[in-house]
């Protein structure tokens, strides 16, 4: 047997205690697919977090960061400080890559140089805080 | 910021057919349903027609049903009503509005008179 | 089809004074019943969901409360803007339905 249900389409929610009776999402919830029981709050994107998609009675809103933070997590679900180039966020904060070690990006951890030696090659351009190495040809 | 412009009113003998239109901007179209919603003059709001977001699911009003079609278009973010079997009591002030019923159009005026 | 009726169906104020309508549904409703403001020539514009959410931008002396059949619309110190019509309408069941609506007037 069919459940009534799903004839409920997205947007609305259906409740069984009501004969199966269809109705509107409320303002700020939504429903993405049809048969629902419940329409979900919509997600606010507020503080370090902005509005990236407006939500809508079929589809959650969807958040990213402000300008000096990006998206962590599934949804970006959290908002982590960028540093500069050549920096790696600690929980002291941004803090410069050690030496022998460079991040080329605003976000993650100081990576140790590439080892050229390793491939039988010679170091072609010194690595810095934001650029790994060069490798050549073989010496 | 989220606009809904209705248009297509105007005076129409009994019997005749007329087709309103919504045009929507400002809010993904798409993924709203929308409500047609009357009101005769000094009267109170009387909902019409309901369209679900990919216009699979619709429902109207007894007073309409039979007579009134209400159809969408997304690719053009507009929300239709064709009307036909016009009657005096279909006189009102026809607003669109998204289903979650916050934002109104400024109203299109449809007068059947003879 | 659930049936909303608003009283009264208008009332004179002065500026700064508290404003009480009411409106009764036939049936059990939930709290799913909006209120809206409509001034002269002009659409309706949503006030409360939920039955006492305030909607984005609407003043706090806008207060709704009330669940099941009964609800309040509370303007706590009525303003000289305020005037116009109020609808109550429910989105418990299509067909959605609205009161006949009260129209607030100044004396």
């Known amino acids: 047997l069919q459940d009534p249900c799903s004839n409920c389409p997205a947007g609305t929610f259906c409740d069984n205690n009501r004969n199966q009776i269809c109705s509107p999402c409320p303002p700020n919830s939504f429903s993405s697919a049809g048969g629902q029981r419940t329409c979900d709050i919509c997600r606010q994107c507020k503080g370090v977090f902005r509005t990236r998609k407006e939500c809508s009675s079929t589809s959650n809103a969807e958040c990213d960061c402000t300008p000096g933070f990006h998206c962590l997590g599934a949804g970006c679900s959290m908002c982590e400080q960028d540093c500069k180039q050549g920096q790696e966020l600690t929980k002291k904060g941004c803090k410069d890559c050690c030496f022998g070690t460079f991040n080329d990006q605003k976000r993650g951890i100081c990576r140790p140089w590439t080892n050229c030696s390793l491939d039988g090659k010679s170091v072609l351009v010194n690595g810095t805080k934001e650029r790994d190495v060069v490798c050549g040809p073989s010496p | 910021e989220v606009q809904l412009v209705e248009s297509g009113g105007g005076l129409v003998k009994p019997g005749g057919s007329r087709k309103l239109s919504c045009a929507a901007s400002g809010f993904t179209f798409s993924e709203f349903g929308m409500h047609w919603v009357r009101q005769a003059p000094d009267k109170g709001l009387k909902w019409v027609a309901y369209i679900s977001s990919g216009g699979s699911t619709i429902y109207y009003a007894d007073t309409v049903k039979g007579r009134f079609t209400i159809s969408r278009d997304n690719a053009k973010n507009t929300l239709f009503l064709q009307m036909t079997s016009l009657r005096s009591e279909d006189t009102a002030m026809y607003y669109c509005?998204?289903?979650?019923?916050?934002?109104w159009g400024q109203g299109t005026t449809l007068t059947v008179s003879s | 089809n659930i049936v909303m009726t608003q009283s009264p169906k208008s009332m004179s104020m002065s500026v700064g004074e508290r404003v009480t309508l009411s409106c009764k549904a036939s049936?059990?409703?939930?709290?799913?019943v909006s209120w809206y403001q409509q001034k002269p020539e002009k659409s309706p514009k949503l006030l409360i969901y939920g039955a006492s959410n305030r909607y984005t931008g609407v003043p706090d002396r806008f207060t709704g409360s009330g669940s099941a059949t009964d609800f309040t619309l509370t303007i706590s110190s009525v303003q000289a803007e305020d005037l116009a019509d109020y609808h109550c309408?429910?989105?418990?069941?299509?067909?959605?339905?609205f009161g006949a609506g009260t129209k607030l007037e100044l004396k």
């Open positions: 309408g429910q989105s418990y069941s299509y067909p959605l339905t």
């Open positions: 049936e059990n409703v939930g709290s799913y």
């Open positions: 509005a998204r289903d979650w019923v916050d934002y």
